[in-house]
Every structure is written in C-alpha cells, then in structure tokens.
Amino acid sequence: SPKMVQGSGCFGRKMDRISSSSGLGCKVLRRH
C-alpha cells in the first residue's frame, strides 16, 4: 500500500491543489 495517503479519493488526485484551506475542495460543478 502507498506510504503516504493524505486525501482520499478525489482529494488524493489534487496534488496541485492539496491545500484544502482554499475551500475549493474537489467539487464537480454541473448545470441543472
């Protein structure tokens, strides 16, 4: 298993924006 996993799921993909204090998270924006 990986030696380091901070964010699970989509948060782990966001290596460019792992800073969660931005409030951006990893939301998917959709038009309803």
Partner: antibody, heavy 117, light 111 residues
Framework: QIQLVQSGPELRKPGETVKISCKGS????????INWVKQTPRKDLKWMGW????????YYADDFKGRFAFSLETSANTAYLQINNLNNGDMGTYFC??????????WGQGTSVTVSS | DNVLTQSPPSLAVSLGQRATISCKAN??????????LNWYQQKPGQPPKFLIY???NLESGIPARFSGSGSGTDFNLNIHPVEEEDAATYYC?????????FGSGTKLEIK
Amino acid sequence: QIQLVQSGPELRKPGETVKISCKGSGYTFTHYGINWVKQTPRKDLKWMGWINTHTGEAYYADDFKGRFAFSLETSANTAYLQINNLNNGDMGTYFCTRSHRFGLDYWGQGTSVTVSS
Amino acid sequence: DNVLTQSPPSLAVSLGQRATISCKANWPVDYNGDSYLNWYQQKPGQPPKFLIYAASNLESGIPARFSGSGSGTDFNLNIHPVEEEDAATYYCQQSNEDPFTFGSGTKLEIK
C-alpha cells in the same frame, strides 16, 4: 496492528461544546489523512470532511461548515473533532477514519453524542 | 451531491446462496479509468468495515466470497456463498467528488 481509538460517549446540553479524540497507532500518523463521518440515529452515514495530518489543513463538507472544527496533536498521534453550540440534530455517532487512496480503510469504534436538556 | 441509491433496502438469503446488492449513482463516479466506488460492511455496535475499493478490488483480509463489479453509475456487491457471519448492513460510498456520499444501506439477513 493499525488502530484508531476514540474517546467515550458524551452527553451534553443544547448550546454546549463537545470535543472528541481519535488516537492512531500501528502506523505513521502524519502519513495518512483523517476523515470524520457522522452516523445519524437513522443509521445514515454522512462524510463531514478531513484533515491533512502532515500540514494540519482541514476541509469541511458544506453541511459541516461553521460549528465544526478538526484539529491535531501530532505529538500524541491524535486528531480531534469539536462541535460547538450543540443542538438535537448533532445527535449520533461520530467516527474517525483513515484515508485510503479510494476509500476509508481503518475506522475508530465511534463516539456517541447525545444532546438533551 | 451525487446521491447513491441502494437496493434492495433489505434482503434475506439462505445460507450458501448468493446475495446481490445494487448501488446506483446519480452520475458517473469514474475518473481516468478508475471507479471511485467503495463498499463497507457494518454490524450492530461496530464501525463500518472496508470491504471493496475502486468497485472491484478486495481489501486485504476480506474473504474471496465478496466481489464487486460495475462502472459509471451502476455497481453491484455480490456475496457467494453467503455465510452466517455476513449478516450485516452494507453501504456503498463514492469518493470521486466532494462531498463523499454513502448509500442508505442494505440490511442482509441470513435464512
């Protein structure tokens, strides 16, 4: 073996504050994020957000912004969840759980929070 | 939020038979060839237990009678042959986007 051990059940009055602890052992605590999950009395599971145990940065799901705070004491391998201004809707069981690449692999035993005047 | 609908809400399966639980997402949970869909088992008084990740990967220590399948929006958890100790509530969960969401659970009873 990997374990997350949480503090015991809490009984609070409306408007009070509760702070739940989650101590990790059996792995390098600062290498894995800690997520918090609420289980409602109806047994629904709600992801509250997570804290980066390396940087201390916290991310909160929209439903848990404002009165909820995640924090760390890395020297004690411990994460905390604080809930302020408690109300009846906060009743349930709170779990800390470790980040896995896809999911949430190790879970604490849960901490029951009861709010009653 | 990406709502996960589990069915059936409960089912009773005879010992040794197959249990199939469905989880349908409002929209796809795939990213770069991976499905960000996980399964958990919860017994009364215990925390959820991590069973399957990325739709079909068995977590370490989980018996091979558990299997997962699906992609996109439609996923299944299969248990075969069902054993007494499998009586529990099963939840699916997506981690493809924020907020992570769980299905409402399927309670499995062994006949």
